[in-house]
């Protein structure tokens, strides 16, 4: 059990295109065919104007036209919905496929890819129907761009909705050594962070988020996964103690603003018969800004690296109310391997601490839209979009 840890199955609320919680000013496009197919007409199920956003330029062969939605705060986007231009039966234009790009800071844009590295998403087959796409992995984003595609020169139009919830953790990125491959007699277990959206260099992943922040906790047997058609070890990121003569794996965590940290929760594997052990201990240090020094003595929490119950579990590391925007934690080896599937934080925003990304305020002047009070995880009065077996989601 991961208290305070978000449940992706419950993070599926409409984020405000259809119900206009997202104002017109937060929807922008690369170009529009006409004012009647401008950005503001891109709302799911809307029949305003000529019934959708339609770009001025062709989307074949170049895929450069986009529709951008600014969510104003970091959200976990778990699902998107698309429609074409129906316009009371007069519209014929829709997009059979599209790509997504997203940004947390308005400066660096990432391509959304599925768990097998595919960027292209199947879209609509007709102008009127809504097609929902489950995003596996989900994306943590403030800004989302839809890039419609076509396989020939043709008109495409788009209406959209995004579904998810506020990203309460406030985690902007984590830095960690690259996950490694475990050689078992019968199989190679790939313990890499396969959805990491930052950079990789010199054995280090930095500047992004990935499987350790996607809400998916691993199974007791790390060779198995809750996901379909993935490789052994998929749910876990793991490191061999043979690669770390220091005896620990060091990670850094960067947050959106100054926070008071209560607890860090780390979901770990403990299948010690195959070498995976809980950490022997955790040491964390804090700092308030990127150029500042790490403050004082680290918070130390001994764990003992249990050899008993081999089930995977969440360990809670008390962080003692320390204040910071950056954490550096060392996870001590108690056995041959450390395997983590999820890391989350329970923290409170320090009052009057302004957001770090982007430099402009998250919210326009005036009060934030009431649907997204910082105290709420989901918009009021809504039900999340269900994720059914063989559901209408792609």
């Amino acid at each position: 059990d991961m208290k305070g840890h978000f449940d992706p199955a419950k993070c599926r609320y409409a984020l405000g295109m259809q119900d206009r919680t997202i104002p017109d000013s937060d929807i922008s496009v690369s170009s529009s065919w006409s004012d009647s197919t401008a950005a503001r007409h891109s709302r799911l199920e809307s029949s305003d104007g000529d019934g959708a956003w339609c770009p001025a330029g062709p989307v074949f062969p170049k895929e450069e036209e986009y529709l951008q939605v600014d969510l104003r705060r970091l959200h976990l986007v778990a699902l998107v919905g698309t429609q074409g231009r129906h316009a009371g039966g007069l519209g014929k234009e829709f997009s059979r496929s599209y790509r997504l790009r997203y940004s947390r800071d308005g400066r660096r844009w990432m391509d959304w890819k599925d768990r097998w590295g595919q960027e292209v998403i199947s879209g609509n087959e007709d102008p009127g129907g809504v097609v929902l796409k489950d995003l596996g992995p989900p994306m943590v984003a403030r800004l989302v761009r839809f890039y419609p595609r076509a396989d020939r020169v043709m008109s495409v139009c788009l209406r959209v909705e995004l579904y998810g919830c506020l990203w309460r953790d406030g985690l902007l990125s984590y830095t960690a050594p690259v996950g490694q491959t475990m050689q078992l007699s019968e199989v190679m277990v790939h313990l890499n962070d396969s959805t990491y959206d930052g950079y990789t260099a010199g054995g280090l992943q930095y500047g992004g988020l990935g499987q350790l922040a996607d809400g998916v906790v691993g199974l007791d047997d790390f060779r198995q996964s809750q996901e379909l058609r993935v490789w052994p070890g998929y749910d876990y990121v793991g490191w061999s103690n043979q690669s770390f003569p220091t005896g620990y794996v060091e990670m850094e965590f960067e947050f959106d603003r100054l926070r008071t940290f209560q607890t860090m929760q780390v979901h770990c594997n403990n299948m010690h018969t195959l070498g995976a052990r809980l950490p022997g201990g955790v040491e964390c240090r804090f700092k308030r800004g990127p150029a500042m020094a790490w403050e004082g003595e680290p918070v130390r929490h001994a764990l003992g690296g249990s050899l008993g119950d081999p089930r995977a579990r969440a360990i809670s590391v008390p962080l003692g109310g320390h204040v910071g925007r950056f954490l550096q934690c060392r996870f001590l080896f108690a056995g041959p391997w450390l395997l983590f599937s999820e890391i989350s934080f329970i923290s409170d925003v320090v009052n009057d601490s302004s957001d770090t990304f982007p430099p402009a305020p998250w919210w326009p002047p005036g009060p934030p839209p009431t649907n997204f009070s910082s105290l709420e995880l989901e918009p009021r009065g809504q039900q999340p979009v269900a994720k059914a077996e063989g559901s209408p989601t792609a």
């Epitope: 491959t181 790939h190 010199g202 054995g203 061999s240 690669s243 770390f244």
Partner: antibody
């Protein structure tokens, strides 16, 4: 992306010498950087490593004899008091991970020759 | 301090043949092992990391195996261009000793 060593020359025993490795096309701040040497006709010998966090590691025989430091574009190897046994070609190399997450020295400089002789 | 021991120091084989080079670690190093090729007057070239993983552009004639303390580099279908000295290295995030090297002579 490339590495180039410089500073190698003929020195007399006991004369301190600093070798510099200059990186082009990337920042050293994100890599483990190693110094390796090779005496004439001999094998490769690891001297030391500096991490992206500026932690240094040395071979037991090299402690006290060599000091490694770096900036964002250069890594220095200081030979505190060279002896004739330190005559060798000195390489700097960059560690990177392969697909399976394990390190290897994927980028090497051409080397610089240090001759210690009286 | 961990020591890497390579055998043999030199091996000779004919074009088209197979060569096996062994590397032994003085204590278990899991899969934290790389192999390099060095030709006279040149800088070393990475062949394999993590025991098995071929570096970019390295032909599949090169094969790494082993775990723990015993490792092997096998070169099959030997070509004249494979004449070189081969080194193993324990390369964690820290200390990184090399083996003594094995010279491969191709007849």
């Amino acid at each position: 992306q490339s590495l180039e060593e410089s500073g190698g020359r003929l020195v007399t025993p006991g004369t301190p010498l600093t070798l510099t490795c200059t990186a082009s096309g990337f920042s050293l701040n994100r890599y483990y950087m190693l110094w390796v040497r090779q005496a004439p006709g001999e094998g490769l010998e690891w001297i030391g490593t500096i991490s992206y966090g500026d932690t240094t590691y040395y071979a037991s025989w090299a402690k006290g004899r060599f000091t490694i430091s770096k900036t964002s574009t250069t890594v220095d190897l200081k030979m505190t008091s060279p002896t004739t046994e330190d005559t060798a070609t000195y390489f700097c190399a960059r560690a990177d991970t392969g697909d399976n997450g394990y390190l290897g020295l994927q980028l090497w400089g051409p080397g610089t020759l240090v001759t210690v002789s009286s | 301090e961990l020591v890497m021991t390579q055998t043999p120091a030199s091996v000779e084989a004919a074009v088209g043949g197979t060569v096996t080079i062994k590397c032994q670690a003085s204590q278990s190093i899991g899969s934290v092992l790389a192999w390099y090729q060095q030709k006279p007057g040149q800088r070393p070239k990475l062949l394999i990391s993590g025991v098995f993983d071929l570096a970019s552009g390295v032909p599949s004639r090169f094969k790494g195996s082993g775990s723990g303390t015993e490792f092997t580099l096998t070169i099959s279908d030997l070509e004249c261009a494979d004449a070189a000295t081969y080194y193993c290295q324990y390369i964690p995030y820290g200390s990184s000793p090399f083996g003594g090297g094995t010279e491969v002579v191709v007849k």
